[in-house]
């Protein structure tokens, strides 16, 4: 149930994720710790990397609200009821800043992807001989 | 805006392998979930399969013997096969894309398959 | 497999009605559950994702509801463009399974 309602969550994240690459060109055009191919076990610490990394609004134009609103989003903290096991990987799986850092859009695309990968597997573990290759 | 077109041909004889291509504009197949959905006539939508943009697949068991689905990213486009075709395939045969895993966001409109003689 | 149930099959309403349409799990699937409107010829389109929430670009008079096994989709003030036929569709597990439809028609 618990897991539930962390994957439910990083459905929605996938939304706000969408919406923010619309505004790629709104967002300071920095180089953020974007994780890729990221090892089993460690999706929760990269996750964690995602949302500690600083994406900015540029400050430009009409989208500066909107933008806002959906970073701070992107950065609420998921129930914590996994957190014990989140701790117990943090210290094997590489830091933050030994990620590739990449500008916004494709630190967008990464996020989404690892979203994905998170929502598949646990479909799958859901599900009995899902996986076909 | 993501826009799917799905087309193949329209007949199918018995026994043979249905195939259908999915083309994809205003978009990237190089991330997401690719899927098939089909709708036989007067009857509800059957989820087929999906893959996804690194080539994983999933498919429903009811069809796994008989079904690829597979994805060519330099064209931007996913493909269908389904083999031994019978007229119990005869479907609307959508293609769809999931961003979210669990839904599918964007859909084409459908192409019909008539499997017959 | 998850069977999906939907009901009424069919719904006769007017433009401004409330419309709700039912959609029943034969087992629980917390809030994996999606709505489609679909109306013929044309490409269906996502209308709530994760029971409640609504897909980007789609009218708030479209709501859902609903955890574990019931779930409902509800059109607050029904439009011209509304009738169509709707789906619920789970995703809680493989294979991803539809429920038969409810079509909503002029009165």
């Known amino acids: 149930q618990g897991q539930d309602r962390h994957m439910i969550r990083m459905r929605q994240l996938i939304d706000i994720v969408d919406q923010l690459k619309n505004y790629v060109n709104d967002l300071v055009p920095e180089f953020l710790p974007a994780p890729e191919d990221v090892e089993t076990n460690c999706e929760w610490s990269a996750f964690s990397c995602f949302q500690k990394a600083q994406l900015k609004s540029a400050n430009t134009g009409n989208n500066e609200r909107i933008i806002n609103v959906s970073i701070k989003k992107l950065k609420r903290k998921p129930p914590s009821t996994n957190a014990g096991r989140r701790q117990k990987h943090r210290l094997t799986c590489p830091s933050c800043d030994s990620y590739e850092k990449k500008p916004p859009k494709e630190f967008l695309e990464r996020f989404k992807s690892l979203l994905q990968k998170m929502i598949h597997q646990h479909l799958s573990s859901r599900t009995h001989g899902s996986e076909d290759s | 805006q993501v826009q799917l077109q799905e087309s193949g041909p329209g007949l199918v004889k018995p026994s043979e392998t249905l195939s259908l291509t999915c083309t994809v504009s205003?978009?990237?197949?190089?991330?997401?979930?690719w899927g098939w959905i089909r709708q036989p006539p007067g009857k509800g939508l059957e989820w087929i399969g999906y893959?996804?943009?690194?080539?994983?697949?999933n498919y429903n068991p009811s069809l796994k013997r008989r079904v690829t689905i597979s994805v060519d990213t330099s064209r931007n486009q996913f493909s269908l096969k389904l083999s031994s075709v019978t007229a119990a395939d005869t479907a609307v045969y959508y293609c769809?894309?999931?961003?979210?895993?669990?839904?599918?966001?964007?859909w084409g409109q459908g192409t019909l398959v008539t499997v017959s003689s | 497999d998850i069977q999906m149930t939907q009901s009424p099959s069919s719904v006769s309403a007017s433009v401004g009605d409330r419309v709700t349409i039912t959609c029943r799990a034969s087992q629980g699937i917390s809030s994996w559950l999606a709505w489609y409107q679909h109306k013929p010829g044309k490409a269906p389109k996502l209308l709530i994702y994760v029971a409640s929430s609504l897909q980007s670009g789609v009218p708030s008079r479209f709501s859902g509801s609903g955890s574990g096994t019931d779930f409902t989709l509800t059109i607050s003030s029904l439009q011209p463009e509304d009738f169509a036929t709707y789906y619920c569709?789970?995703?809680?597990?493989?294979?991803?399974?539809f429920g038969g439809g409810t079509k909503v028609e002029i009165k």
């Open positions: 569709q789970q995703a809680a597990s493989f294979p991803l399974t």
């Open positions: 893959i996804s943009s690194r080539g994983s697949t």
């Open positions: 769809a894309r999931s961003a979210g895993v669990t839904d599918f966001d964007f």
């Open positions: 205003g978009g990237s197949i190089s991330s997401d979930f």
